[in-house]
């Protein structure tokens, strides 16, 4: 049904005809996410009519239908102004049961109405800066946080939980004040860590979480994203022991996330959000990643369980295949692995064994090839400064921040950027908590060491002799040309 016909029906005001018109419009446009310009004015008119009814109060019988139409039109940027008013937002917040009001809602809310209103709010907050501001002013985050805290006590449908969390994500992503409010005043890290634990469910110790079901995966990812937003600005500072305990507790849950698969091909996405959040934890709290007890089938190295580090490394390998948005893809996991390697010797030795195994092939440039080392060395000359820095930093830490060793594995040309940035061009080693980690040279490396070009990091083929096959006269002619060039230079 055309928006004009629906608007006309609304203006005549016969209830059944209106409802039928709205239902027909909803059916036709349930999957419309873009709208043609031809009917823009009709849609705007329809939006204005819907808003006037919304602000007066929708009839209980047909609320869901009206809200569905509002949801569809809230995807249309040209209709945003109509919906993004204080009264409209308040009405939607009331139907979503997240308005801060003096009088409590008398009867339990209708979940279908609640869900539709949440979806409308998500669309509006996503696309309208005015709606973002009004939602922040209306302190919707307070009631949303309150409801997230009720998930343990009361049963809410998956979709309601998901859109609660999605709205929290949008508000915290788009509004600094909401981020701070949720972080400080509403104890968001505690609240959402608890929600994450509830969502991950329980697995007996003998049978750790293996595959997270689809709905739980969706909710867990929204929680991880909200936690990322609220910890992004706040956590790099020093934390006291009780806060550190909370972040370590969160870290243990994230450890399970890294080790778990997600249903429906969403494992990499799930791990991506997990790794992003790990990167926000206070550095001293990352020790929980290596605190896993050894058990049958776990990967042991120097007496430590390396399952998590190995899973992060596998994740990095997967991410290195991607060509677009490389910074978002690899920087977080490289940062986490770098910090683990920096503070934990067994982790560093394990990662070095995997990433920088003893050099054998000394004839290929370090950046050429498909090994993890080659890919990371290639990143060291990437156009994006951050990508370049994290890749170099990771390899440098694996070399125990030893300049000669770093050059040995990456070549001086590739290493120069990081060394210059750190003022280490002359060699030496910066301050760091590294014991004298030995670096074992292979037979092949020892034999070729004298012939390796330190700039390229490989044995160069001897260039052909340019004088080969020249007559004595030709040689003399070339020599004279050279003398003339030097003569010009010295003038």
């Amino acid at each position: 049904m055309e928006p004009r016909a629906v608007a006309d029906a609304l203006e005549t005001g016969e209830e059944d005809a209106v409802t039928e018109a709205l239902r027909s419009f909803n059916r036709e446009h349930s999957q419309s996410f873009t709208f043609d310009d031809a009917q823009q004015e009709d849609r705007k008119r329809l939006a204005k009519l819907l808003v006037s009814v919304l602000e007066q109060g929708l009839s209980p019988k047909h609320r869901v239908t009206w809200l569905q139409t509002i949801r569809i039109l809230s995807r249309d940027r040209s209709c945003l102004d109509s919906f993004a008013s204080r009264q409209s937002l308040h009405a939607l917040a009331c139907y979503a049961d997240i308005a801060i009001s003096e009088e409590p809602i008398p009867q339990p809310p209708d979940m279908d109405v609640l869900l539709e209103s949440l979806k409308c709010l998500c669309n509006l907050v996503l696309s309208s800066p005015t709606a973002q501001m009004l939602a922040a002013e209306a302190r919707l985050v307070v009631r949303l946080a309150e409801r997230v805290g009720l998930y343990r006590k009361r049963s809410y449908p998956h979709e309601v939980q998901f859109f609660d969390l999605r709205l929290l994500f949008l508000l915290t992503a788009l509004r600094t004040d909401v981020r701070q409010q949720l972080f400080q005043e509403l104890h968001g890290v505690r609240l959402l860590t608890d929600a994450l634990e509830l969502t991950l469910g329980v697995a007996p110790k003998e049978n750790p979480l293996v595959i997270l079901p689809a709905q739980e995966t969706e909710r867990a990812m929204e929680i991880l994203k909200v936690l990322f937003n609220i910890t992004y600005d706040s956590v790099k500072r020093e934390v006291d022991e009780e806060d550190a305990a909370l972040y370590r507790y969160l870290g243990t849950l994230l450890r399970h996330c890294v080790m778990a698969d997600a249903a429906g091909d969403r494992t990499e996405e799930f791990h991506g959000h997990t790794v992003n959040l790990l990167g926000n934890l206070p550095l001293k709290c990352l020790d929980v990643l290596l605190a896993l007890e050894l058990h049958e089938g776990s990967l042991e190295f120097m007496g430590v369980n390396m399952d998590v580090i190995n899973a992060l490394l596998a994740f990095l390998e997967k991410r290195l295949h991607q060509t677009h948005r490389l910074k978002e893809c690899v920087a977080p996991v490289l940062s986490v692995l770098t910090e683990c390697a920096r503070m934990h010797r067994p982790a560093r030795k394990f990662l070095k064994a995997q990433v920088l195994p003893p050099l054998r092939d000394v004839r290929t440039r370090p950046e050429v090839g498909d090994l993890l080392r080659n890919k990371l060395v290639r990143l060291m000359t990437h156009l994006d400064t951050d990508v370049k820095r994290v890749a170099a930093e990771f390899l440098f830490v694996l070399c125990s921040e030893s300049v000669p060793r770093f050059i040995k594995y990456t070549g001086y040309g590739n290493a120069a950027g990081l060394l210059a940035a750190r003022g280490l061009m002359a060699g030496g080693r910066p301050e760091g908590q590294y014991s004298e980690d030995e670096d074992t040279d292979t037979e092949e490396y020892r034999e070729a060491k004298a012939s390796i070009n330190p700039v390229t990091g490989r044995v160069e083929e001897k260039p052909p002799n340019p004088m080969e096959g020249m007559t004595e006269e030709q040689k003399e002619h070339e020599a004279m040309k050279l003398v003339n060039m030097f003569d010009k230079l010295s003038r």
């Epitope: 860590t193 243990t252 849950l253 450890r255 929980v288």
Partner: nanobody
């Protein structure tokens, strides 16, 4: 209604051991993280250690290596095994849900004195 009941406290000499227990009701215990806290006379209540629903544990530095938290989901109970006790461990010990605290019980008194 959430209820948490701590027991097992008592008087013990320095270097001795005690095992505290906490029985929980009114919560879906197995999906909850749990923690032990303590409050010494004239001091703020402080966190001692936590256990996740997966059984992972975290402890405050001063009790690491001496205290062990475990849980029994079948009995809705969490316990705190305290070894090599010191006089500074004297306090009233409480258990609670974690990371969001729900309800504080009466606690159980632990006194370490020669």
């Amino acid at each position: 209604q959430v209820q948490l009941v701590e027991s097992g406290g008592g008087l013990v000499q320095p270097g001795g051991s005690l095992r505290l227990s906490c029985a929980a009701s009114g919560i879906i215990f197995r999906s909850n993280g749990m923690a032990w806290y303590r409050q010494a006379p004239g001091k703020e209540r402080e966190w001692v250690g936590s256990i996740t629903s997966f059984g992972d544990t975290i402890y405050r530095d001063s009790v690491k290596g001496r205290f062990t938290i475990s849980r029994d989901n079948a009995r809705n109970a969490v316990s705190l095994q305290m070894n090599s006790l010191k006089t500074e461990d004297t306090a009233v010990y409480y258990c609670n849900t974690y990371p969001v605290n729900s309800y504080w019980g009466q606690g159980t008194q632990v006194t370490v004195s020669s």
